[in-house]
Interface confidence: medium
């Protein structure tokens, strides 16, 4: 005997990436005859709809008139026919986008340091950003990832002349939307007496300060779900 009904489809219209303060509709398509649909947000009940007449309706819509960071996250829906509930839908990542933002990159103790000094970069973005990336300009696969509500710290540890270069940071929104780059910060490291030779342009960073992430074609993992466009970006994992 069947214990659950087939899972519904969930998608966002016009798109799962929603600019701040814009409207979005979350759609849930189940079966004709469903008497109740539930929308869950981050694992908790968010909204309920009871279509009338249920035998003529197989899709419901949950309208969000004013998208903001508190509404961004994972949604799923379920429905029931009589007392029988469906499997939950796939997860829908609803992302708020504030695409014109530019983070601020700063460095402590300053952009000109002596080899051996401990250096920390700070990337700040005063909007709903969850992840930050610090990139050194040039053909390097070395990227440092940081997290924070408005600011991430990127400790380089004791630097050497190999850390010389121009750095920028980006803020990302749920791995789906990226900010503009920060203004560049040029780090100048004065070499010590024993090692004054110029470093190569893109050195291999010490393992304890930089994650060595080679970004290959396998990095982007795409999952296609019917009726909605969602790219699961397995960034730098």
């Amino acid at each position: 005997q069947q214990q659950t009904l087939p899972k519904p489809f969930i998608w966002a219209e016009p798109h799962f990436m929603v600019p701040k303060e814009k409207q979005v509709t979350i759609c849930c398509q189940g079966n004709y005859g469903a008497v109740e649909y539930q929308l869950h947000f981050e694992g908790s009940l968010f909204a309920v709809d009871r279509p009338k007449p249920p035998e003529r309706i197989n899709k419901v819509q949950f309208y969000i008139p004013d998208m903001n960071s508190r509404m961004a996250g994972q949604y799923s829906c379920i429905y029931r026919v009589g007392e029988l509930w469906s499997e939950p839908s796939n997860l829908l990542d609803l992302v708020v986008t504030e695409m014109y933002d530019t983070p601020t990159l700063s460095v402590h103790p300053g952009p000109e340091v002596i080899s051996g000094e401990k250096v920390t970069f700070y990337c700040r973005l005063d909007t709903a950003t969850s992840m930050f990336l610090l990139l050194k300009e040039g053909r390097s696969s070395h990227v440092q990832r940081g997290y924070g509500k408005v600011q991430a710290e990127f400790p380089l540890g004791p630097v050497t002349t190999a850390h010389r270069g121009t750095y920028r940071c980006f803020g990302s929104y749920n791995n789906h939307a990226w900010s503009f780059p920060s203004e560049p910060v040029k780090l100048l490291v004065t070499g010590d007496i024993e090692n004054t030779s110029l470093a190569p342009e893109d050195p291999t960073f010490p393992a304890d300060t930089w994650g060595t992430y080679l970004l290959t074609t396998e990095t982007g993992l795409q999952k296609d779900h019917a009726l909605w466009d969602h790219t699961a970006q397995n960034l730098l994992r």
């Epitope: 016009p14 798109h15 990436m17 600019p19 986008t97 695409m99 014109y100 990336l133 990139l135 990227v143 980006f170 990302s172 939307a177 990226w178 900010s179 503009f180 780059p181 970004l215 990095t219 982007g220 795409q222 466009d229 790219t231 970006q233 960034l235 730098l236």
Partner: nanobody, 115 residues
Framework: QVQLVESGGGLVQPGGSLRLSCAAS????????MFWVRQAPGEGFEWISV????????DYAASVKGRFTISRDNAKNTLYLQMNSLKTEDTAVYYC????????RGQGTLVTVSS
């Protein structure tokens, strides 16, 4: 399904020019900042340019600033990169992308700058 298809690459002499195009489909193109990144043989990805959703603001990595120009046509869902004063060190596979690391990108178009 997200699709990004680059074209316009080829062999060019130092000092020459090329214009790359990227046809986007499967997503709301005008909702995204769009990026060009490149990858030289045996190297990692290098972010080189970004343009905002409306196409009125752009930024460039220092290595290409003043030589490359990014633009977009939202009506045609197309991203462009005009490359002037090309140097041998610009030889790479060029990708359009939705992020500065090239995680969501096309198949790329090869640009070879050689005499």
């Amino acid at each position: 399904q997200v699709q990004l298809v680059e074209s316009g690459g080829g062999l060019v002499q130092p000092g020459g020019s090329l214009r790359l195009s990227c046809a986007a489909s499967g997503f709301a193109f005008s909702n995204y900042n769009m990026f060009w990144v490149r990858q030289a043989p045996g190297e990692g990805f290098e972010w080189i340019s970004v343009i905002n959703r409306g196409g009125d603001t752009a930024d460039y990595a220092a290595s290409v600033k003043g030589r490359f120009t990014i633009s977009r046509d939202n009506a045609k869902n197309t991203l462009y990169l005009q490359m002037n004063s090309l140097k041998t060190e610009d030889t790479a596979v060029y990708y359009c992308a939705r992020d500065p690391l090239g995680t969501t990108r096309g198949q790329g178009t090869l640009v070879t700058v050689s005499s």
